[in-house]
């Protein structure tokens, strides 16, 4: 059974998580961002289904593809350059999902551009946060 | 309504330039890019460029590179195109197009092209 | 330079539907978008993001993509449907835009 401890730990990264999936958003869905209609030509694969930490497997499946449309964006956008941010993103997803778990992603039917995956992936952040809390 | 309204028709020599000119209302001008696409007689659309209305941003087709220049005047809403070194193949009717980003609640799509020029015939000939 | 390829031609009868393909290698990762063309006159959308309709685009055109191929299709084509059909998408990197060659659709 998890620990206090565990808990704890585990909001926390679902916490950082989601800062860093939020800056990301904010730095690209900007009218300053001159990149922004050519980074919604790049389309995501959005999970089936998304309410447990092992479903965090789809998301490291699409961090490469996150980081090629994030270097088409300026770096003052970001903290961070995109090698770096979808680097700390990766290692917060494999302490998540557990690395030693071998799951296979199913992906809807539906693509999406990067603003809906985003959304997306924040809204599986809130929604694990609110039933640790 | 949205309207892009272009300039008239332009007859050149091979060797010369011409600008062609896009004037936009009907909408917040610098809050969309332009694109300019050309059609050369009986053939399909070929894609030339793109102009950041916002902070004149600039991304030009391999093929034109060097030859083509575009930019906006924010205080007329004006966007304009420069081709210069015209040859033969140039000629074409040229058109602008307004490009840029829509929302549908928590979606954001690109939408290229949704509203067009009537388009500007240049005829390049000796 | 990145393609995009169309077949250059399609016929068919009214009320048939017509499907109109288009192949690009960054296809899997990148939307496609239609226009149609009337003769003597400035393209319209028809399809952006692979599959949605904007406004005031009739229900019988649709739009699918799979792999490296994008599809329109036009459910029950009319008369008024015949025009030169084309495919955009932008390379993998995203910053160099291209139109496929067009098709043209013939109604009769």
């Known amino acids: 059974a998890p620990t206090s401890s565990s808990t704890k730990k585990t909001q926390l990264q679902l916490e950082h998580l989601l800062l860093d999936l939020q800056m990301i958003l904010n730095g690209i869905n900007n009218y300053k961002n001159p990149k922004l209609t050519r980074m919604l030509t790049f389309k995501f694969y959005m999970p089936k289904k998304a309410t447990e930490l092992k479903h965090l497997q789809c998301l490291e499946e699409e961090l490469k593809p996150l980081e090629e449309v994030l270097n088409l964006a300026q770096s003052k956008n970001f903290h961070l350059r995109p090698r770096d941010l979808i680097s700390n993103i990766n290692v917060i997803v494999l302490e998540l999902k557990g690395s030693e778990t071998t799951f296979m992603c199913e992906y809807a039917d539906e693509t999406a551009t990067i603003v809906e995956f985003l959304n997306r992936w924040i809204t599986f952040c809130q929604s694990i946060i609110s039933t640790l809390t | 309504q949205v309207q892009l309204v272009q300039s008239g028709a332009e007859v050149k020599k091979p060797g010369a330039s011409v600008k062609v000119s896009c004037k936009a209302s009907?909408?917040?001008?610098?809050?969309?890019?332009i694109s300019w696409v050309r059609q050369a007689p009986g053939q399909g659309l070929e894609w030339m460029g793109w102009?950041?209305?916002?902070?004149?941003?600039?991304n030009y087709a391999q093929k034109l590179q060097g030859r083509v220049t575009m930019t906006t005047d924010t205080s007329t809403s004006t966007a304009y195109m420069e081709l210069r070194s015209l040859r033969s193949d140039d000629t074409a009717v040229y058109y602008c197009?307004?490009?840029?980003?829509?929302?549908?609640?928590?979606?954001?799509?690109?939408?290229?092209?949704?509203?067009w020029g009537q388009g500007t015939l240049v005829t390049v000939s000796s | 330079s990145y393609e995009l390829t169309q077949p250059p031609s399609v016929s068919v009868s009214p009320g048939q539907t017509a499907r109109i393909t288009c192949s690009g290698d960054?296809?899997?990762?990148?939307?496609a978008y239609w226009y149609q063309q009337k003769s003597g006159q400035a393209p319209v959308m028809v399809i952006y993001?692979?599959?949605k309709r904007p406004p005031g685009i009739p229900e019988r055109f649709s739009g699918s993509s799979s792999g490296t191929m994008a599809t329109l299709t036009i459910t029950g084509a009319q008369v008024e449907d015949e025009a030169d059909y084309y495919c955009?998408?932008?390379?993998?990197?995203?910053?160099?835009?291209?139109f496929g060659g067009g098709t043209k659709l013939t109604v009769l």
């Open positions: 197009a307004r490009e840029g980003a829509i929302y549908y609640d928590s979606s954001g799509y690109y939408f290229p092209f949704d509203y």
């Open positions: 009907g909408y917040t001008f610098t809050s969309y890019g």
């Open positions: 102009i950041s209305a916002y902070n004149g941003n600039t």
């Open positions: 960054a296809l899997p990762r990148k939307f």
């Open positions: 993001g692979d599959s």
């Open positions: 955009y998408s932008t390379d993998s990197g995203g910053d160099v835009s291209v």
